[in-house]
């Protein structure tokens, strides 16, 4: 079954290469287990950035080497991606699956365009 997922259109990463955005899903019921996948689309290529599952009210559990962290609040997931560089600029798409209880729902957002600007190197001091 399809589900609506909303996310901001544009986000600018900080000078430290950190970008945060909210992914909100219109849950038809009371999901207790949710899977969230962040995908990056650039030059018509789509790659998985990170994925996590969580029980409602708990922190998102990403893999140890993930560049993503996140928290959940109700039907909102607050995602943070770190270690971004200019070459990582692209459309970051939020995919949400309500895993339990049945029925299963899946929703895909329209994506958040994340712009990353590499900081200028500090000039050498004499």
């Amino acid at each position: 079954k399809a589900m609506h997922v909303a996310q901001p259109a544009v986000v600018l990463a900080s000078s430290r290469g950190i970008a945060s955005f909210v992914c909100e899903y219109a849950s038809p019921g009371k999901a207790t287990e949710v899977r969230v996948t962040v995908l990056r689309q650039a030059d018509s290529q789509v790659t998985e950035v990170c994925a996590a599952t969580y029980m409602m009210g708990n922190e998102l559990t990403f893999l140890d080497d993930s560049i993503c962290t996140g928290t959940s609040s109700g039907n909102q997931v607050n995602l943070t991606i770190q270690g971004l560089r200019a070459m990582d600029t692209g459309l970051y798409i939020c995919k949400v699956e309500l895993m339990y209880p049945p029925p299963y729902y899946l929703g895909i957002g329209n994506g958040t365009q994340i712009y990353v600007i590499d900081p200028e190197p500090c000039p050498d001091s004499d």
Partner: nanobody
Framework: EVQLVESGGGLVQAGGSLRLSCAAP????????MGWFRQAPGKGREFVAD????????YYADSVKGRFTVSRDNAKNTVYLQMNSLKPEDTAVYYC????????????WGQGTQVTVSS
């Protein structure tokens, strides 16, 4: 159109095992993920397990974790669901599904195979 064909369902006693298979005859899987779902009478479709075709990463519903194993055979273009320690509450029609791509939903579905666990 991808045609998924399941097999391996049947009647088994509680504590027994079954292995379900899902194949796409005459087609090579290039799907992002393959999954298994089930539907008991009068209930919504429930996620059981899935496997990513590229790297074999798996994910299981809590209700089957430690009892069910999903696997794939690239050479045979087949996905399996090994079900051990079956319980009466596992009784349902089991469906195989495929995601056509990373940005897809579950685009393709099999016809379903009945699994009945008697106590």
């Amino acid at each position: 159109e991808v045609q998924l064909v399941e097999s391996g369902g049947g009647l088994v006693q509680a504590g027994g095992s079954l292995r379900l298979s899902c194949a796409a005859p005459g087609r090579t899987f290039s799907n992002y993920a393959m999954g298994w779902f089930r539907q008991a009478p009068g209930k919504g479709r429930e996620f059981v397990a899935d496997i990513r075709w590229s790297d074999g990463r798996t994910y299981y519903a809590d209700s089957v974790k430690g009892r069910f194993t999903v696997s794939r055979d690239n050479a045979k273009n087949t996905v399996y669901l090994q079900m051990n320690s079956l319980k009466p509450e596992d009784t349902a029609v089991y469906y195989c599904a495929a995601q056509g791509g990373v940005l897809s939903g579950w685009d393709y579905w099999g016809q379903g195979t009945q699994v009945t666990v008697s106590s």
